[in-house]
């Protein structure tokens, strides 16, 4: 069976928009469907439609298509906002330029090159012809619009209304002529949707045929509309992923605008003595990297070959061998004249914000060079040079020593959650600093999000105990007790560590808490043989806003048939939508005669955007949250379940993908649960386990 082409790439999408017909004579056709792709395929093929389809609306709430013989530019029609609607207009009907020979052109130009009005295609006056709309179905020989139904050289044409001139081509420009860009096109927001070799671009909001990281909702400022060429990553010019499964991406043929000036909004603040932000506007003359090695000239290919040339990166001032940041790196850099060191950062250039004790950082703060030297817990930072041994223990590369001066907050290990420092306090060996991200900074902090295909499961198989897979075992489930009563759930992720929520700790006195492991009954009835009761020796609070706590046990749990650990997901991983997961807890059940036994509710993973819709748009989820909806209406976590896990299985391996936290009500029908996304904090968890001392068993 021939695989039907996906035609949604031929449409321009306007989110949260519908069309209302003012003229009652205009027809529309509706039908229940599952996806916008299905609507698009039918619109393109005009299958079963009593008109030529020019646009459609997909109603996400009702899962319905509305096909139209008109678009937003037609008369008798108005645009209207609607949360549940997405409008898709066939680009051929709204484009005012041609691609190639203009065979697909369906615009409304109706005047020839010399200015003569076109003859309607259905008329035989003044010229008789065989180009009847009925003979050229799908070629849109409507009214008297210029067309090229046979794809002839010269582009769209028409019979003219002048009896002396039978036909003439129309003066419709090539899209590649109309479209132009400044510099390397990072600010280009035009409508070019095919590559320089003519391949159609893949939509940015699609992951087929090519999976990629550039999701429109993750990069709202990059202009990822439809399938238009863009330059989000500092390439020499705009590009796109293609619909050809064998060509992942290609550049687009967009010429440089004659008046090559940038908009004010595109110009980074130019500085010559210091670095503002990531230093994209640095135009000074420093020409050595941090350790004094001279820079290679940008226009030279020796000793290192590269494509970061002044020709490829116009407007980036790649003069001489000066440090620059043409590609949105952490800070200005250059290729070096040492054949063994390809590139180096010029981190000796001071930060313009250096005078502020408490400023802000961009991205994950890897390049923060401020002079704050106090942690969020109020402890004074200790000198970096006293802690290099500890630092080497948990990073596997040589840190940039020029940045680690004094006891200032820094991020030498690429921590996703910002600058930190060592404290000299054995209770809190290191902690984050009270610096926030700069306002308006949208740099993603998860490096791995570049590869959304990253699996959450480590590749190992499910652990087997005594030859039987422990699939039914929930030995990692912890009952946290506060003053002898159950208060929260938790997950045993290591013999000495329990992952739970910060809302589970109403007291700072650790003597108020105990962890019960190996139990099924919240009161421990009948669990005497398997129950382990452990004191709590420390609470390590997660990064700012995480709501997570790592609870250190006074002694390690003994792993046996009733007590086991649960795996953590890979950092920054994505779990597919509709993956079946479970939440566990001893919390409020709504039952008067609750038996105290551990309960499970089955949920399935839901994408953040869809989740937000279920919350009526009142909730915007971010990269640190994960959403799961109930299979059974009105089931889900509640008070007493907080701190407990959202457990999912991938490649036969169970992992804690979410942590239950308060704040969204209990199991409200049609309101999916929002959990802390453990994958976002996995590196922090590993770093704590690695750097905090635990008692030996």
């Amino acid at each position: 069976q021939r695989k039907r082409r996906n035609t949604i790439h031929e449409f321009k999408k306007s989110a949260k928009t519908t069309l209302i017909k003012i003229d009652p004579a205009l027809k529309i056709k509706t039908k229940k469907v599952n996806t916008a792709d299905q609507c698009a395929n039918r619109c393109t093929r005009n299958k079963g439609l009593p008109f030529t389809c020019k646009a459609f609306v997909f109603d996400k709430a009702r899962k319905q298509c509305l096909w139209f013989p008109f678009n937003s530019m037609s008369s008798g029609v108005k645009k209207e906002f609607g949360h549940e609607f997405d409008l898709y207009e066939n680009k051929d009907y709204i484009r005012n330029c041609i691609i190639g020979k203009g065979r697909s052109y369906k615009g409304t130009v109706s005047i020839t090159k010399s200015g003569i009005k076109c003859q309607p295609w259905s008329s035989m006056i003044p010229h008789e012809h065989s180009f009847l709309p009925s003979s050229y179905r799908g070629k849109d020989l409507q009214e008297n619009y210029c067309r090229n139904p046979r794809g002839e050289e010269g582009g769209p044409w028409c019979f003219t209304s002048n009896p002396e001139v039978r036909y003439e081509v129309c003066d419709i420009p090539q899209c590649s002529e109309v479209e132009c860009m400044t510099c390397n096109g990072e600010s280009y927001r035009g409508l070019m949707d095919h590559t320089e070799s003519g391949k159609i671009c893949q939509r940015w909001d699609h992951q087929t045929p090519h999976r990629h990281k550039f999701l429109p909702e993750r990069y709202p400022d990059k202009g990822f509309d439809d399938n238009y060429c863009r330059n989000p990553d500092g390439q020499p010019r705009p590009w796109c992923y293609t619909l050809d499964p064998h060509t992942r991406w290609e550049y687009c043929a967009i010429k440089t605008c004659a008046d090559n000036t940038m908009n004010d909004t595109d110009v980074p603040l130019e500085t010559t003595e210091c670095i503002q932000g990531q230093g994209e506007g640095y135009r000074g003359t420093v020409n050595t990297i941090w350790n004094g090695i001279p820079c290679q000239r940008w226009d030279s290919q020796y000793p290192h070959e590269h494509d970061m040339t002044p020709e490829n990166f116009k407007c980036k001032d790649l003069r001489e061998n000066y440090c620059r940041n043409p590609d949105g790196s952490e800070s200005p850099w250059c290729f070096t004249t040492d054949p063994n060191i390809r590139v180096g950062y010029c981190s000796q250039i001071p930060n313009c914000d250096m005078s502020h004790g408490q400023d802000c950082y961009r991205g994950n703060g890897k390049n923060y060079m401020g002079n704050l030297s106090q942690t969020r817990s109020g402890l004074t930072c200790s000198m970096w040079d006293k802690n290099m041994e500890d630092l080497h223990r948990h990073i596997f590369w040589e840190p940039d020593a020029s940045k680690l001066n004094e006891n200032y907050c820094r991020n030498p290990d690429d921590d996703a959650h910002g600058p930190w420092c060592y404290t000299g306090n054995p209770l809190i060996p290191w902690d984050y600093c009270p610096i926030s991200r700069c306002e308006g900074d949208t740099t993603p902090t998860i490096v791995n999000l570049d590869h959304p295909v990253i699996s959450c499961a480590k590749t190992k198989q499910l652990r087997v105990v005594n030859g039987i897979p422990t699939r039914t075992n929930i030995g990692w489930m912890v009952s946290l007790r506060y003053r002898n009563k159950h208060i929260c759930g938790g997950s045993l992720i290591k013999e000495s560590w329990v992952l739970t929520a910060r809302q589970c700790f109403p007291s700072r006195d650790l003597k108020d808490y105990e962890a019960w492991l190996g139990i099924h009954d919240v009161h421990g009835r009948g669990d005497e043989k398997c129950k382990q009761v452990l004191n709590v020796s420390q609470l390590v609070y997660g990064p700012e806003g995480s709501d997570l706590v790592l609870m250190k046990l006074a002694r390690p749990a003994v792993l046996d048939d009733f007590v086991s650990t649960i795996d953590l997901p890979n950092y920054g991983c994505t779990i597919p939508e509709k993956t079946s997961c479970s939440v566990y807890g001893w919390g409020y059940t709504g039952l008067i005669n609750y038996d105290g036994l551990l309960r499970v509710a089955h949920l399935y993973i839901m994408g953040n955007e869809k989740c937000s819709q279920h919350h009526r748009g009142k909730v915007t989820l971010n990269e640190s949250e994960i959403c799961a909806g109930a299979e059974k209406i009105g089931s889900g976590p509640c008070e007493g379940d907080y701190g407990g896990p959202l457990v999912c299985e991938q490649h036969k391996m169970r992992m804690v993908l979410g942590v239950i936290v308060p704040g969204r009500g209990c199991a409200i029908p049609n309101r999916p649960g929002i959990f802390v996304r453990v994958a976002y904090y996995a590196k922090w968890i590993h770093k704590i386990i690695l750097t905090y001392k635990v008692p030996q068993s």
Epitope: R376, G378, Y482, R483, P506, R508, P662
Partner: antibody
Framework: QGQLQQSGPELVKPGASVKISCKAS????????MNWVKQRPGKGLEWIGR????????NYNGKFKGKATLTADKSSSTAYMQLSSLTSEDSAVYFC?????????????WGAGTTVTVCS | DVVMTQTPLSLPVSLGDQASISCRSS???????????LHWYLQKPGQSPKLLIY???NRFSGVPDRFSGSGSGTDFTLKISRVEAEDLGVYFC?????????FGSGTKLEIK
Amino acid sequence: QGQLQQSGPELVKPGASVKISCKASGYVFSSSWMNWVKQRPGKGLEWIGRIYPGYGDTNYNGKFKGKATLTADKSSSTAYMQLSSLTSEDSAVYFCVREELGPYWYFDVWGAGTTVTVCS
Amino acid sequence: DVVMTQTPLSLPVSLGDQASISCRSSQSLVHSNGNTYLHWYLQKPGQSPKLLIYKVSNRFSGVPDRFSGSGSGTDFTLKISRVEAEDLGVYFCSQSTHVPYTFGSGTKLEIK
């Protein structure tokens, strides 16, 4: 981030008692401490005590033991403070204040205050 | 009880000037868990106090970066780098390390 709606002003006689209320919204009432703070006209702030609605736990400033009684009703997300044996010294504005749990332990949401006036 | 001593009681400043308020506690505010629970609040006339700085030096959300806090142990400082008209009011330091929680007597920031 949450809101606290306090009951209206009270005019009471010496020796009487008064019960003022504080209704919470926009956050999980049972998962934060509710504190009460006293402010006499032109004076500083004095901490009276706090209650953890999830468990009914209370801590009091020794100075207000026997004077203030803190209670909470989880079903209506409302905290109460009863002041007994009132004297002119008890005339003040009383604030209910949410205390965020660890790692913070700060007062991030304040009610608008309830004015209690004791006069014969 | 921990006594919080704030100085000065009144601080007349010109708009655009830097202002500095000191707060001293009668005992260390470092909790046994390593954290220092010293916070700063601002109360404008006729309003409830609002949180500015928590745990010595963390700016609360929405607080302008002209406010900064520093200090350790028993000595703490709140600095306003360039005073604006909206900053006028009474500033209180407060500790939540030891029960009962206690407040400083307040510093009134006013126009010179």
